[in-house]
């Protein structure tokens, strides 16, 4: 039996179709293709005869198709008028015709789509952020990529206004990174340049590792000791020191040479993230003896959180 | 006292390279990041990059990448910037300064400045 | 790169007058901004960090203020030792940028 196959059945605009026929019959002399579900000759495309390979064109020819001897027929640079149903006939020697009809959707091409934001430097844990993909465009689905891999499911994602828009609620530090939208019709699909999502956060309650000599929690009069300090913050927060309430200097490392019973006291570090508006800090008392006992670093320390 | 010492000034060629130091004293060579800053006469100030002296990373500036070179030799308490294939527009003066703190701090100690003149 | 625009580019003023310079950040700096001084042929000095925030020995009237993308230096009263050219700069990470400096000048 005759049937018609369109390769591809969903045609993006511009692109071009192919009307492929197959089990042709063995007696024919030529063929009709028309517009629409039924032989008119106000419809006919382009008639064909095989003995003299010559094409003819009909009222309904725009000069975008071509007929091939296999009845096959191309039509490039397609329109979404072009939607809907094509019929063949093909004349056979007994004049007893056959005929076919096939059908293609034609959708428009996808422009790139955008992504604008409301926020792309939230702070966590305070701010919102909301994605919107644009421009809108009808019968289009939308997707959303996050560095790479489709939406993970979480309470904290919303997405709305037919997925165009994405909602971040309460940004987390692990929200940050690559977003792009993507649009897409039957036929085609089209994705959005990235954009980088910066979340704002810490700085956290530091941490002090006793880098010290000799080793331990021990400190012994004469000992280098080495307090080295890190708070998890975006931007990398401002790191202080205060032994003894005394503003000291404004390094991660706080370096003493050659200790003394002179240095006990409580050794704060202080962190601070202007971006986010917040500051923390860790508070360890050190005890140096003058001989061979050895006491040490209060390792239960004070933990000062501020907004 | 915080001190940064820079060598001396320096008239070079166009197409030559010119290696300037800067020598810190008065505090923990290794705990504060250094930079440079260069002013060409009558002009503004222009950052150039900076190097870690505790690691050696350094990050230059856009401009002078591929131009620029910084090291730090920690036995002596220096470091060095080179800047190769000079032109004209190089004539400046060339700061050393010390970052006030670890991270997002401005610069709180300078060289007093080695003037490169590049001249044929 | 972040963009930083400082005006006037000069000014002129009598001694004791309050006098005030502006930046601008192409970018939010959250805070992150410094003022350096430099008076002529002499190597900058910093004045004020963290957009407020005074150097130690920096007399008091000088004060720094301003958030997000505009900043003020304010001097409350000008004395002649504070002719020199003022520049801003933004600290929050590299690449630095500096702003093309403010020239103060007495009447």
């Known amino acids: 039996k005759l049937t018609i196959e369109s390769t591809p059945f969903n045609v993006a605009e511009g692109k071009e179709v192919l009307l492929l026929a197959h089990n042709l019959p063995q007696n024919r002399i030529g063929y009709s293709w028309y517009k629409g579900e039924r032989v008119d000759g106000n419809s006919l495309i382009v008639g064909y005869v095989i003995g003299t390979q010559q094409a003819t064109p009909g009222p309904a020819y725009s000069g975008r198709e071509t007929i091939y001897p296999n009845a096959s027929l191309l039509i490039q640079n397609v329109t979404q008028n072009d939607t809907g149903f094509y019929t063949l006939q093909v004349i056979k020697s007994d004049l007893v015709n056959e005929e076919a009809t096939g059908q293609f959707h034609v959708y428009p091409e996808l422009p790139k789509p955008s992504i604008s934001s409301n926020n792309s430097n939230p702070v966590e844990d305070k701010d919102a952020v909301a994605f919107t993909c644009e421009p809108e465009v009808q019968n289009t689905t939308y997707l959303w990529w996050v560095n790479g891999q489709s939406l993970p499911v979480s309470p904290r994602l919303q997405l709305s206004n037919g997925n165009m828009t994405l909602t971040l609620l309460s940004v987390k530090r692990n929200d940050a990174g690559s977003y792009e939208c993507e649009i897409q019709n039957p036929a085609s699909a089209n994705r959005s340049d990235p954009v980088t999502l910066n979340v704002l956060y810490g700085p956290d309650v530091p941490t002090i590792s006793p880098i010290i000599s000799p080793p331990d929690s021990s400190y012994l009069s004469g000992a280098n000791l080495n307090l080295s300090c890190h708070s998890a913050s975006n931007p990398s927060p401002q790191y202080s020191w205060r032994i003894n309430g005394i503003p000291q200097q404004h390094t991660q490392v706080l370096f003493i040479a050659k200790i003394t019973p002179n240095n006990n006291g409580t050794y704060a570090c202080f962190v601070s993230n202007l971006a986010t508006g917040r500051n923390n800090s860790i508070v360890k008392s050190i005890t140096v003896s003058a001989s061979g006992t050895s006491p040490g670093l209060s390792a239960g320390a004070h933990h000062h959180h501020h907004h | 006292q915080v001190q940064l010492v820079q060598s001396g000034a320096e008239v070079k060629k166009p197409g030559a390279s010119v290696k300037v130091s800067c020598k810190a004293s008065g505090y923990i060579f290794t705990s504060y990041y250094l930079h440079w800053v260069r002013q060409a006469p009558g002009q503004g100030l222009e950052w150039i990059g900076y190097i870690n002296p505790q690691t050696g990373y350094t990050s230059y500036a856009q401009k002078f990448q591929g131009r620029v070179t910084m090291t730090r030799d920690t036995s002596t308490s220096t470091v060095y910037m080179e800047l190769s294939s000079l032109r004209s527009e190089d004539t400046a003066v060339y700061y050393c300064a010390r970052e006030y703190g670890n991270y997002n701090y401005p610069l709180d100690y300078w060289g007093q400045g080695t003037l490169v003149t590049v001249s044929s | 790169d972040i963009q930083m625009t400082q005006s006037p580019s000069s000014l002129s003023a009598s001694v004791g007058d309050r006098v005030t310079i502006t930046c601008r950040a192409s970018?939010?700096?959250?805070?992150?901004l410094a003022w350096y001084q430099q008076k002529p042929g002499k190597v900058p000095k910093l004045l004020i960090y963290n957009t407020k925030n005074l150097v130690e020995g920096v007399p008091s009237r000088f004060s720094g203020s301003g958030s997000g993308t505009d900043f003020t230096l304010t001097i409350s009263s000008l004395q002649p030792e504070d002719v020199a050219t003022y520049y801003c700069?933004?600290?929050?990470?590299?690449?630095?940028?500096f702003g093309q400096g403010t020239k103060v000048e007495i009447k």
């Open positions: 700069q933004h600290h929050l990470g590299t690449p630095y940028t």
């Open positions: 970018e939010n700096q959250y805070g992150y």
